[in-house]
């Protein structure tokens, strides 16, 4: 990692606990004004690779609710409403950080966890594999 | 929030600090085996709404490196390679959690922060506004 100069105003930490366990303030600073992904845009419906948003809930995780995109079609939607299988709808995935309660049910102790979520879908040209 | 039963094996927390400040174990548990998004798939190049990935680095943030997608075109790429401006390439955005060092430069004290990142692009039918 990058060496950070120690600031004398920092909370104290014993070497044995650092950097394995840190203090995190949960008063979230929101750098944007976005809302629920179902409301923030209608791209999921207007896309040539439209998707449905499924609610994934887990009380042992923060955030407890994550929206997962599932592509509606294997092909892509043309202007005439036909689904074109010469093109493929695929999920765009993003690795995100969440906090997992550890030990389970503990209100003030967490572990960082990386999970892969599908955020939306895009239309791609397929790679065609023919049989020799 | 959801009421979680207190587990007797939980680390202790004083009410005045809870739930504002919690302990977080930074030994990340990875629930997937994904790699750098530039390598994990070539969708960004094969999409009808292709995008470039830009590296956003901030040593005061964890993760310090985030990849931001920027759509290459305003329109969408057709099978013949031409860009169709009757359709629009738009970024798919995702709100993610990051840890921000607070106070600045402190190695073991963070604040949760929500930021909006563009993960990839999708091709949508534009909303046409006609002049009355």
């Amino acid at each position: 990692g990058i060496a950070i100069p120690r600031n004398s105003g920092c909370p104290n930490s014993e070497d044995k606990n650092f950097p394995r366990t840190v203090m995190v303030n949960l008063n979230i600073h929101n750098r944007n004004t976005s809302t629920n992904p179902k409301r923030s845009s209608d791209y999921y419906n207007r896309s040539t690779s439209p998707w449905n948003l499924h609610r994934n809930e887990d009380p042992e995780r923060y955030p407890s609710v994550i929206w997962e995109a599932k592509c509606r079609h294997l092909g892509c939607v043309k202007a005439d409403g036909n689904v074109d299988y010469h093109m493929n709808s695929v999920p765009i995935q993003q690795e995100i950080l969440v906090l997992r309660r550890e030990p389970r049910h503990c209100p003030n102790s967490f572990r960082l966890e990386k999970i892969l979520v599908s955020v939306g879908c895009t239309c791609v040209t397929p790679i065609v594999h023919h049989v020799a | 929030g959801i009421a979680i039963p207190r587990n007797s094996g939980c680390p202790n927390s004083e009410d005045k600090n809870f739930p504002r400040t919690v302990m977080v174990n930074l030994n990340i548990h990875n629930r997937n085996t994904s790699t750098n998004p530039k390598r994990s798939s070539d969708y960004y190049n094969r999409s009808t709404s292709p995008w470039n990935l830009h590296r956003n680095e901030d040593p005061e943030r964890y993760p310090s490196v985030i990849w931001e997608a920027k759509c290459r075109h305003l329109g969408c790429v057709k099978a013949d390679g031409n860009v169709d401006y009757h359709m629009n390439s738009v970024p798919i955005q995702q709100e993610i959690l990051v840890l921000r060092r607070e106070p600045r430069h402190c190695p073991n004290s963070f604040r949760l922060e929500k930021i909006l990142v563009s993960v990839g692009c999708t091709c949508v039918t534009p909303i046409v506004h006609h002049v009355a």
Partner: antibody
Framework: EVQLVESGGGLVQPGGSLRLSCAAS????????VHWVRQATGKGLEWVSV???????TYNSALKSRFTISRENAKNSLYLQMNSLRAGDTAVYYC???????????????WGQGTTVTVSS | DIVMTQSPLSLPVTPGEPASISCRSS???????????FHWYLQKPGQSPQLLIY???NRFSGVPDRFSGSGSGTDFTLKISRVEAEDVGVYYC?????????FGQGTKLEIK
């Protein structure tokens, strides 16, 4: 209980038209795709068309110019309009539900009993 | 169009014995999303087809565990560990990765 009931089959002359219906119950057409699949006597299965939950469609390109799939959500019914019929279109026509949207398997999990179309002069 | 070729076309089996049907596609059935949309159906005499296996190896609800599916890419297999009298009929493989969706020509399983 999921049920699909086809109707509208019968004897028609070459060049004629026919409209098949499929009445669905136990599920909503705006939550599942529904296919038409046909089977000539003693032959295998041939896929005809599908209308997906969002109203988009996919056709067997060999038949697209003559066949049109549609649905009426209020009646929870699916239709197949067949024009310029030929002797080769003689078959049992099945409607079958797709697992699409809910489970994303893109397989046909429930089938109707079929309706027979005979094209002959 | 994707051609699905089944073998054998006829399969006489003694009850209690295993049975195996192969299906080969003319093109890979792996979608750009990484999944394979390959399925098996059974059409019993005088009945409509019924789904047995979806996405290569998943048994549809109510399908006995003596049925199993395997394979990848272009080569797939349906196995019945111990054939029962009620298993007679025509078995079809199918793909929905590419349009038009296609079926194999069918394998007729009969009891010896």
């Amino acid at each position: 209980e999921v049920q699909l009931v086809e109707s509208g089959g019968g004897l028609v002359q070459p060049g004629g038209s026919l409209r098949l219906s499929c009445a669905a119950s136990g599920f909503s057409l705006d939550s599942y795709g529904v296919h038409w699949v046909r089977q000539a006597t003693g032959k295998g299965l041939e896929w005809v068309s599908v209308i997906w939950s969002d109203g988009t469609t996919t056709y067997n390109s060999a038949l697209k110019s003559r066949f049109t799939i549609s649905r009426e959500n209020a009646k929870n019914s699916l239709y197949l309009q067949m024009n310029s019929l030929r002797a080769g279109d003689t078959a049992v026509y099945y409607c079958a539900r797709d697992t699409h949207y809910r489970l994303y398997y893109y397989a046909m999990d429930y089938w109707g009993q079929g309706t027979t179309v005979t094209v002959s002069s | 169009d994707i051609v699905m070729t089944q073998s054998p076309l006829s399969l006489p089996v003694t009850p209690g014995e295993p049975a195996s049907i192969s299906c080969r596609s003319s093109q890979s059935l792996v979608h750009s999303n990484g999944d394979t949309y390959f399925h098996w159906y059974l059409q019993k005499p005088g009945q409509s087809p019924q789904l047995l296996i979806y996405k290569v190896s998943n048994r549809f609800s109510g399908v006995p565990d003596r049925f199993s599916g395997s394979g990848s890419g272009t080569d797939f297999t349906l196995k019945i560990s111990r054939v029962e009298a009620e298993d007679v009929g025509v078995y079809y493989c199918s793909q929905t990765t590419h349009a038009p969706f296609t079926f194999g020509q069918g394998t007729k399983l009969e009891i010896k």
